[in-house]
């Protein structure tokens, strides 16, 4: 439950008051003003968009809204020099060539700057020759076809279908191998659900529809030319050439008709098994190179796109804390989209919009919160995280310092069947907490909580009578201050059925057709989901802001350090042999996770008992609990990724989306088995135990007694 | 076999209405979308509107979409136009047609129906 | 509106001639193109789909091509039946409009 609050100026002034002004028919009328045009980052469009956002903020009572702008490396098709994919014949004569942009969606037709699909910040190219299909483009795909099938990719161009991971690493890993060029599909078998048709008459991606995004591998980094610092006018810039996570071969994403048209013709090997295969009509061979009567054709890229330094714009809004102002809980997600963005970012911003607009209307009325509130709409998300991470950047002093939590808020569907959460440990008891309190949306939970209908579908797989929450990855804007500063951070947003629906990420993601219209009519018409996200999203803001302790629990993270900790160990006792040539022991993490429980119980009941209306003790308290994550943080950061600095979660170096826990360790680990110097290997698992174990029992440390 | 069968056309007054019909056999209607096309005598050929699998989406030419009203019937397999404000310009063959999806080109099509609009 | 530009009008070829009719968009519409025969009295039939695939039924002397904004129809060794009127379509985009044809005489 909510505390009562000296801050409030009647007891109305409650989290009940601000759920119940938050409105869905507001959030709809939010979302149709938000996707209408394009809000390309970098476009004239997001700057208008930026500005009403200020003014609308401004309208809603904050106490103030800022727009901060960066100078960042963006990329963009040439208008006048399409970006396609040929097949060429023997003469060097095009056969045939891949679609230019997509078929507009239907009442669309006359709409302007719809950006054509493209690779953002692929290289300029025009490599040409054999194709080789590479299932996912994953670590293991080029295990399986290295290793097992001896297919050797250098010099070839690689076709890999989108899904699984994030798509900077499938390039990555081509680029690893030797290939030449890649080209990205969405096959069927990921991004057309059986029974279900296709836009605009269902959920589902038609053969013309291609997904945009970014091939980078910034590992954190921000804007490519200024790692580490904010790209601000005085700041030095990198050369292209050391630019940070810039790829080197040339990349385009195609839809699954012309995809057919590519695959069609392959030849060489059959593809290993059954995994390998989507839903096309083709055989899936790999390759390299066409069949038999097709031999002679080839594939050639055209890639004309271009990287400029180009203005972007956050928007910052603030509503000071009456008690702790220099205290600050962040609600941050992207205005920045491909396209219209019905989903990605806008089902979000238009949450945002609503919560600011519940919050304004309680401090209209006299309320403030305890803390601080920042409210960000982030620019650049599409193109690496870019406004998030220099604006946090540019205020790292301050955040380190300040930041009590940051909740993020890009789309808040991708699905209509659960809630999806993915937070700090020391957050599982206050999302826990607030579900109970909120009703669920879904068909057959009338009138029961939301904790109720999230555990029955989402189950944890460790505790029964709980539901799942997830690591936090990446690929989002809570990157920078999760990763890189220590701030405890969460997300939200409804979910789909994982059990039935098999496909990555939801099937017009980034495509074209991500309309208000596929909200409307699709996913969420009554837009009761979203209300959902907004109080779950909203609550948490709330609660983080307002209560006199903060919703904290550090017994949880002890419990996950326990679990990471077996993880990794069982991982390693793979290789019980090794372990034993170079004395490798975990006995140290096993110890500091237990040191680390035992101090988090006794600060658990030290936290229970202690006087908290003297405000000394109870500032002294919080800043144990804010300042717990920060502990987690390596100033050194993760090997060859520096700005990956928490010792306990990093965004997997195979999948960013994907959280790794312990992922030095991990790293270390992984294929140890091929590595040529196994002293060497086994010397870093060692080297990353010891890191590991530090950090646990510094963090224990900030929990123990002060004095 | 694939069958499209348009009501009678016929003669009508300027400014009046008219309601075509157009019944399907021979597949399953309710997998395609339905679509009626015109012509007039002796010229090219003219999309007027079409409808999407279930009838929530219907699509029109702009300058007919104030005055025709495409519908189905997917329990009669009927396909349906209504014509309001009729003006001697109207005047042409109408065929209904059928197509796969949105994006998508017309596999079927009736034998055509004339209708004249003139005093 | 994407427009659609079809020549010649009209075309007279002897029976065993081949003939090819083109058709021009007024923007880029990839393959999204369909070919059409209609005999005097008659309803259109489907020819081609995807500016180069061949309806069931539709003899291997009509063949497509073209991509992006320029298209063609070909008809090798012209036969009796193959004479009447041709209109290509679009269906890139609403509204999905026709050529304004063209019709194939006997000489």
């Known amino acids: 439950k909510s505390s009562s609050e000296a801050t409030n100026i009647t007891p109305k002034h409650n989290m009940k008051a601000f759920l119940d002004e938050l409105k869905a028919e507001n959030i709809k009328k939010f979302l149709h003003n938000f996707t209408q045009i394009p809000h390309l980052a970098g476009t004239e469009q997001n700057f208008q968009l930026a500005k009403q956002i200020q003014s609308q903020w401004k309208e809603f009572g904050l106490d103030s809204v800022e727009l901060t702008h960066y100078d960042v490396l963006l990329s963009y098709p040439n208008k006048t020099h399409p970006n396609y994919i040929s097949i060429i014949n023997e003469d060097g004569n095009e056969i045939f060539n891949t679609s230019l942009f997509e078929p507009p969606p239907a009442g669309y037709e006359n709409v302007s700057d719809i950006v054509p699909p493209f690779s953002a910040f692929s290289p300029q190219g025009m490599p040409e020759g054999d194709l080789v299909y590479v299932n996912y483009a994953r670590t293991e795909d080029f295990f399986k076809l290295e290793r097992d099938m001896k297919i050797n990719c250098s010099g070839k161009i690689v076709i890999a279908r989108y899904g699984k991971v994030f798509r900077g690493n499938k390039v990555k890993n081509a680029q690893l191998a030797g290939a030449t060029g890649v080209i990205l599909y969405s096959d069927p078998a990921d991004y057309f659900a059986p029974g279900v048709k296709s836009y605009p008459d269902g959920w589902n991606l038609p053969g013309g529809g291609v997904q945009r995004g970014n091939i980078l591998n910034l590992n954190g980094a921000g804007d490519p030319l200024t790692p580490g610092y904010p790209a601000n006018e005085y700041a030095y810039r990198r050369g292209i050439a050391e630019a940070v996570g810039l790829p080197s071969i040339p990349v385009h994403p195609i839809g699954y008709y012309d995809a057919q048209k590519l695959l069609e013709k392959m030849g060489g090997s059959a593809s290993p098994d059954s995994s390998w295969r989507g839903s096309l009509k083709v055989p899936y061979n790999v390759g390299p190179g066409f069949t038999g009567n097709f031999s002679t054709q080839k594939v050639k890229m055209h890639i004309h796109s271009t990287s400029e330094v180009t203005r972007i714009y956050n928007v910052i809004g603030t509503l000071r804390g009456a008690v702790e102002p220099d205290r600050y809980v962040i609600l941050g997600g992207h205005r920045d989209s491909w396209v219209f963005g019905g989903i990605d970012p806008q089902s979000g911003a238009a949450v945002v919009h609503e919560i600011v607009r519940s919050f304004g209307t309680l401090k209209k009325e006299g309320w403030r919160p305890r803390r601080t509130i920042l409210f960000a709409s982030w620019d650049a998300e599409e193109f690496g995280l870019l406004g998030s991470t220099e604006w946090a950047e540019e205020n790292s002093r301050l955040l380190q310092e300040r930041g009590v939590a940051y909740i993020n808020a890009d789309s808040s569907i991708e699905g209509n069947y659960t809630l999806r959460v993915d937070c700090t440990p020391l957050m599982y008891s206050l999302v826990y907490n607030l579900t109970k309190e909120l009703e669920s949306p879904d068909e057959g939970f009338e009138g029961k909580s939301l904790y109720e209908s999230w555990t029955k579908k989402s189950p944890s797989p460790e505790f029964s009578g709980m539901p799942r929450i997830s690591k936090l990855g990446s690929g989002n804007d809570f990157e920078v201050f999760f990763q890189r500063l220590g701030i405890a951070s969460g997300r939200a947003r409804y979910t789909k059925n994982w059990e039935t629906n098999k496909f990555s990420s939801y099937p017009l993601y980034h495509s074209v057709y991500e309309t208000y219209e596929l909200v409307e009519k699709f996913y969420d018409p009554m837009f009761k989901y979203h209300l959902t996200v907004a109080q779950v999203r909203g609550g948490m803001v709330f609660e983080l802001a307002n209560s006199v302790v903060l919703p904290f629990d550090c017994r949880d993270y002890a419990v996950v350090l326990r679990k990471y900790a077996d993880k990794i160990y069982n991982i390693s006792m793979k290789h019980p042999q090794e372990m034993k040539t170079y004395s490798v022991s975990f006995d140290s993490l096993f110890s500091a996770v237990k040191n680390f429980t035992e101090i988090a119980s006794k600060f658990s009941e030290r936290l229970r008992d202690f006087d908290k209306s003297n405000p000394i003790l109870l500032r002294m308290m919080n800043d144990q609990l804010m300042f717990l994550e920060r502990a987690f943080i390596d100033p050194l950061g993760l090997p060859d990724r520096p700005f990956y600095r928490h010792v306990i979660y990093a965004p997997s170096s195979h999948n960013k989306y994907a959280g790794e826990s312990f992922p030095g360790i991990y790293d270390a680990l992984f294929d140890i088995e091929s590595k040529v110097d196994p002293s060497q290997a086994w010397g870093e698992v060692k080297r990353q135990i010891s890191i590991a174990t530090f950090t646990v029992q510094a963090a224990a440390e900030t929990l123990s007694e002060v004095a | 076999e694939v069958k499209l069968v348009e009501s009678e056309g016929g003669l009508v007054q300027p400014g009046s209405s008219k309601k075509l019909s157009c019944t399907a056999s021979?597949?399953?209607?309710?997998?395609?979308?339905m679509a009626w096309v015109r012509q007039v005598p002796e010229k090219g050929l003219e999309w007027v509107a079409s409808?999407?699998?279930?009838?929530?989406?219907?699509y029109y030419l702009d300058s007919l979409k104030s005055r025709f009203i495409i519908s189905r019937d997917n329990a009669k397999n009927n396909l349906y136009l209504q014509m309001n404000s009729l003006k001697s310009e109207d005047t042409a063959t109408y065929y209904c047609?059928?197509?796969?999806?949105?994006?998508?080109?017309?596999?079927?099509w009736g034998q055509g129906t004339l209708v004249t609009v003139s005093a | 509106d994407i427009q659609m530009t079809q020549s010649p009008a009209s075309l007279s070829a002897s029976v065993g001639e081949a003939v090819t009719i083109t058709c021009r968009a007024s923007g880029n519409i990839h393959n999204y193109l369909a070919w059409y025969q209609q005999k005097q009295g008659k309803s259109p039939q489907l020819l081609v789909y995807n500016a180069e695939t061949l309806a069931d039924g539709v003899p291997s002397r009509f063949s497509g091509s073209g991509s992006g904004t320029q298209f063609s129809l070909k008809i090798n060794s012209l036969r009796p039946e193959d004479f009447g009127s041709y209109y290509c379509?679009?269906?890139?985009?609403?509204?999905?409009?026709f050529g304004g044809g063209t019709k194939l005489e006997i000489k």
């Open positions: 379509q679009h269906f890139w985009s609403t509204p999905p409009t």
């Open positions: 047609a059928g197509s796969d999806g949105y994006w998508a080109w017309f596999a079927y």
């Open positions: 409808i999407n699998y279930d009838g929530s989406s219907t």
């Open positions: 021979g597949f399953t209607f309710s997998d395609y979308y």
